[in-house]
Each structure stands twice: as structure tokens, then as C-alpha cells.
């Protein structure tokens, strides 16, 4: 990731680099070519990050936290490149780095501000707690503190509970919303302003379906074009809620185009899948198939939840036998 700001004529150049937790980054620094190159990278003007002079690294007094995590672009030093390759950044690495570059001609000092962000893919969950229904938007690890917004039928909701747990290096956040008795559609957006990354969860409840025993049911599940990008890896899961917990009926992975089916009466139409239609059929219904069916389409950028309520009623024959 390269700098957002680079002021060429200011002697103390200050650039901003945004890194992602556990990924590698480059702290940029350039200089006018010259002989006898000396490069010293320091953190917060105190800790030695990397030293290079007389043609080789000198890491004897390198701060232990940088051991085996830093290197220069050795083949490019003679071309004026003093950038530092920095492995596996952590939130503790955030701060100001100073690059001192000296040659027989001149000495320059560059400052680089490193900011580190975390955004582990959030999830949207649908939960039943006794007689209440909840939608929960949660993110296991995020930094800095994200902006969470809820919408009901595309209208922002001001009520926004946030359960926050802060660990040493990031936040874990749950935002539950009570949707008991509602037929509205809901949307939750979690935004990491530093990483400029936004995730959206969308929940839609379909009209209840009444079916007779032994019949089949077709349940629709089509992504909303606003979020869905077929080029992006995603996963589709169909599950059924039984006594408060969901059991997975089938799932599809776009990366491998694999479909795994756990319920023999479940069927997916391959042709429809190719058209990004993940509607499913459940054959030979029985009374125990009554309940809520959840289609979950998830990628790194969104989760689309579609809920169907199915009521299976005894057929006339079954009823008359009883």
C-alpha cells in the first residue's frame, strides 16, 4: 500500500501508509542517489527498526520486536530506494517511523505514519430467544471502532445497541436488533473508515407458505444486484431451524462450484445456480418439515439472509385415516 500524501519540497516528508493486521506492508522512502549509502529506520524516534551501511545490514542493536520482520530492497538501494519491507504488521506497530538516509552528497529524513486496521469478515445471524426473534450483526475483530448503522425498509433506525469487547489489539462487536413480529426487511452496515471497507448484511422475510404433506415446496433465494458480484467468492447455505437451532440442508461454494447436500429430499437446479438463482426444492414434505428456512448468501462484503416460513399440513387422506 503506498502513501496517501507525499510532499516533495518539505525537508521532513510525512507520508501515511495504511496496513492490514498480519499482512506485509512497505514503508516508502526515496533519496537522491549517491555513494556511501546509510539507511537507519527508527520507530517513534527511539526504537531501532533497521540499519544498513557499508553495503550490508547492521541489526545488532535492532529492537527485538522487529527481528526477522524487516528488510530493504537491496538491489534498488543504488537507485535511491530506501523503502522498508515490513512483515506481519500488528496494531502495536502503529506510529511514526523515521527513515534517515545519508550519502556522501546529502542527508535526508523522511517520516512515515503507519496506521493499522483490522476487519475480520462480519456476520449477520438470525436467532430465536424464547419468543423473541433477533438479528445480530457482529464482527469478531475490528480496528479502529467501526460505524454500525441499521435500516428498516431502507429507512435508518436510530436505536442501535452495541455490545463491545475490547481486547489488547482490536474490538469484538455485536449489534443485536429485536425484530419480533416484523415482516420488514432489515439492513445492517459495518464500516471500517481506515481500511475504507464496508460490509452489509441484509435480511428479508418472505410470505409464509402453506403446503400439504407429500407435496414439494420451492423456496426462492436470489441475491440483490446492489450487493452481489458474481466474480467475487461467495457461499450459499440453506438451513432449517429446528427447536431454536439451524441444521444445514445444503451449501454451495462459488470458488469450487461445489454443492454439498445433506438432505436427500433437497434439490438445487444447476442451471439456475449458473444464473445466480439459489432457489431450492424440498420434495415429499412431512409434518416435521414445518419451520423456518434460511438462505444465507455470504461474501467478504455482504451477507444476504432470506427467511421462509413453511407450514406443512396433513393431507386429506392422512387426516381421514386419523
Amino acid at each position: 500500500i503506498f502513501p496517501l500524501a507525499f510532499f516533495i519540497y518539505v525537508p521532513m516528508n510525512e507520508q501515511i501508509v495504511i496496513g492490514r493486521l498480519d499482512e506485509d506492508i512497505i514503508l516508502p522512502s526515496s533519496f537522491e542517489r549517491g555513494s556511501e549509502v546509510v539507511i537507519h529506520w527508527k520507530y517513534q524516534d527511539s526504537y531501532k527498526v533497521h540499519s544498513y551501511y557499508k553495503g550490508s545490514d547492521h541489526l545488532e542493536s535492532q529492537d527485538p520486536r522487529y527481528a526477522n520482520r524487516t528488510s530493504l530492497f537491496y538491489n534498488e538501494i543504488q537507485n535511491g530506494n530506501a523503502s522498508l519491507f515490513f512483515r506481519r504488521v500488528s496494531l502495536l506497530d502503529e506510529g511514526i517511523y523515521t527513515c534517515y538516509v545519508g550519502t556522501a552528497i546529502q542527508v535526508i529524513t523522511n517520516k512515515v505514519v503507519l496506521k493499522v486496521g483490522v476487519f475480520l469478515t462480519p456476520v449477520m445471524k438470525y436467532e430465536k430467544r424464547n419468543t423473541n426473534s433477533f438479528l445480530i450483526c457482529s464482527v469478531l475483530s475490528v480496528y479502529p471502532r467501526p460505524i454500525i448503522t441499521w435500516k428498516m425498509d431502507n429507512t435508518p433506525i436510530s436505536e442501535n445497541n452495541m455490545e463491545e469487547t475490547g481486547s489488547l489489539d482490536s474490538f469484538s462487536i455485536n449489534s443485536p436488533l429485536n425484530i419480533t413480529g416484523s415482516n420488514s426487511s432489515y439492513e445492517c452496515t459495518i464500516e471500517n473508515s481506515l481500511l475504507k471497507q464496508t460490509w452489509t448484511g441484509r435480511w428479508t422475510m418472505k410470505d409464509g407458505l402453506h403446503k400439504m404433506q407429500s407435496e414439494h415446496v420451492s423456496l426462492s433465494c436470489q441475491p440483490v444486484n446492489d450487493y452481489f458480484s458474481p466474480n467475487q467468492d461467495f457461499k450459499v447455505t440453506w438451513s432449517r431451524m429446528k427447536s431454536g437451532t439451524f441444521s444445514v440442508l445444503a451449501y454451495y461454494l462459488s470458488s469450487s462450484q461445489n454443492t454439498i447436500i445433506n438432505e436427500s429430499r433437497f434439490s438445487w437446479n444447476k442451471e439456475l445456480i449458473n444464473q445466480s438463482d439459489f432457489s431450492m426444492n424440498l420434495m415429499d414434505l412431512n409434518l416435521s418439515d414445518s419451520g423456518e428456512y434460511l438462505c444465507n448468501i455470504s461474501s467478504d462484503e455482504y451477507t444476504l439472509l432470506t427467511i421462509h416460513t413453511v407450514h406443512v399440513e396433513p393431507s386429506q387422506e392422512t387426516a381421514s385415516h386419523n
Epitope: 546509510v38 551501511y53 557499508k54 534517515y100 542527508v107
Partner: antibody, heavy 120, light 107 residues
Framework: QVQLVESGGGVVQPGRSLRLSCAAS????????MHWVRQVPGKGLEWVAV????????DYADSVKGRFTISRDNSKNTLYLQMNSLRVEDTAVYYC?????????????WGQGTLVTVSS | DIQMTQSPSSLSASVGDRVTITCRAS??????LAWYQQKPGKVPKLLIY???TLQSGVPSRFSGSGSGTDFTLTISSLQPEDVATYYC?????????FGPGTKVDIK
């Protein structure tokens, strides 16, 4: 142009202390390593100590280790040499000198020197 | 620590002569060697660094060579203003020891 002006020399008894100063101008002092070099009148040059540009690293000649301390104040553009437990053999002209770069190279500019005489 | 020796300790030569001074390190120092000239009553002046690179403003009659342990400073045609003591200094790592010096004068 680079200017280095030493001060603080004088006559001192063995065992006593003295602090030399070097006022630097004409260059960005905080960007360069600095050395002290001494010379007994009529004899050769002896390297004494070096300090890196930001003061983080210091090195000394064996003959002064544990007795002399090099330091710098970058906000005042000044280099210092604190000399304790002085001996007769420390009598010399002390030169303040600028390193080519950060404190790991040769001297490219010298001051005029200040004479330290250790005598009882 | 690495010791630096110079030879000869002094020499006399005629104006126009080629003069060679040798500096030897007790261990290899690559090309991290500088040469200084100190005229009587003056402060030292840098002549050559990196064993063979001439400092700007220094006359081209001065040249340096060598690498590892053996180095030479050559004055191709001695001039009256070259009367001085010449010192080598290692700077591969501290301590940055000087050689004992070679005094050059005119016959």
C-alpha cells in the same frame, strides 16, 4: 560553510574533570555523527570517541573508555566531551570533527582544537 | 582491535619526485580507509576516502589504492606545498584508529 568551534580546554590537575564543548554551525547538526580526535603537540592523531547523529550509539578508544563520555544536544547544535579521572597522558589538543554521515565514517571537517593540559 | 602501521615514518624527496606512502592494517578492512594531510600548525584535511576516492578540491597528483590490509598514498609529482604529515585512518568499524603518520619534507 561548516564551522566547528571547541571550548572548555585549560590546565587541570590529574584525577580532576573537564568538559569540552563544540559549537557547530553551517550544517544540519542533528543529521551527522560527530567525533573527538586528540593530538599531543608534535605527535600523531589519536581517535577518541564518536557519537551517532541522534546520540543512540557511542564508541570510545580503549585509552579513554570508562573515563570519558561523549554526548550531544541537537537542539543546541553542540557536542560535548566529559573527561573524568584525567591523567597526564590525556594532555593534547582536542579536535571536534564532523562525520561524513551518521557516525560510522571518516571525518570530513575539523574544528581548530582546544588544548587540554593535565599537570600537577 | 585492528592496528594501523605506516611506512616510512618520514621521508625527504625532491620537488617533482613520485612519493609513495604505505599503510597496513593488522586485519582486513575492505576499502574503508581514509588519508589525511596535516600541514605544520594546521588542522588535518581529508585527502582520500574509500581507499582511492579523491575528496573534491584535492589536486589530482594525489591518489590512493589498495584494499583489505595494504594501502598506498601516492603523490605523483611532489610540490613544496605538500610538506606535511600524512595519516591513514580505518573506518570499517569503531575504534576508528589512525596510523602513526608519515612526515614528508623537501630535500
Amino acid at each position: 560553510q561548516v564551522q566547528l568551534v571547541e571550548s572548555g580546554g585549560g590546565v587541570v590537575q590529574p584525577g580532576r574533570s573537564l568538559r569540552l564543548s563544540c559549537a557547530a554551525s553551517g550544517f544540519t547538526f542533528s543529521n551527522y555523527g560527530m567525533h573527538w580526535v586528540r593530538q599531543v603537540p608534535g605527535k600523531g592523531l589519536e581517535w577518541v570517541a564518536v557519537i551517532w547523529y541522534e546520540g543512540s550509539e557511542k564508541d570510545y578508544a580503549d585509552s579513554v573508555k570508562g573515563r570519558f563520555t561523549i554526548s550531544r544536544d541537537n537542539s543546541k547544535n553542540t557536542l560535548y566531551l566529559q573527561m573524568n579521572s584525567l591523567r597526564v597522558e590525556d594532555t593534547a589538543v582536542y579536535y571536534c570533527a564532523k562525520d561524513l554521515i551518521s557516525g560510522i565514517y571518516y571525518v570530513d571537517h575539523w574544528g581548530q582544537g582546544t588544548l587540554v593540559t593535565v599537570s600537577s | 582491535d585492528i592496528q594501523m602501521t605506516q611506512s616510512p615514518s618520514s621521508l625527504s624527496a625532491s620537488v617533482g619526485d613520485r612519493v609513495t606512502i604505505t599503510c597496513r592494517a593488522s586485519q582486513g578492512i575492505s576499502n574503508y580507509l581514509a588519508w589525511y594531510q596535516q600541514k605544520p600548525g594546521k588542522v588535518p584535511k581529508l585527502l582520500i576516502y574509500a581507499a582511492s576516492t579523491l575528496q573534491s578540491g584535492v589536486p589530482s597528483r594525489f591518489s590512493g589504492s589498495g584494499s583489505g590490509t595494504d594501502f598506498t598514498l601516492t603523490i605523483s609529482s611532489l610540490q613544496p606545498e605538500d610538506v606535511a604529515t600524512y595519516y591513514c585512518q580505518k573506518y570499517n568499524a569503531a575504534p576508528f584508529t589512525f596510523g602513526p603518520g608519515t612526515k614528508v619534507d623537501i630535500k
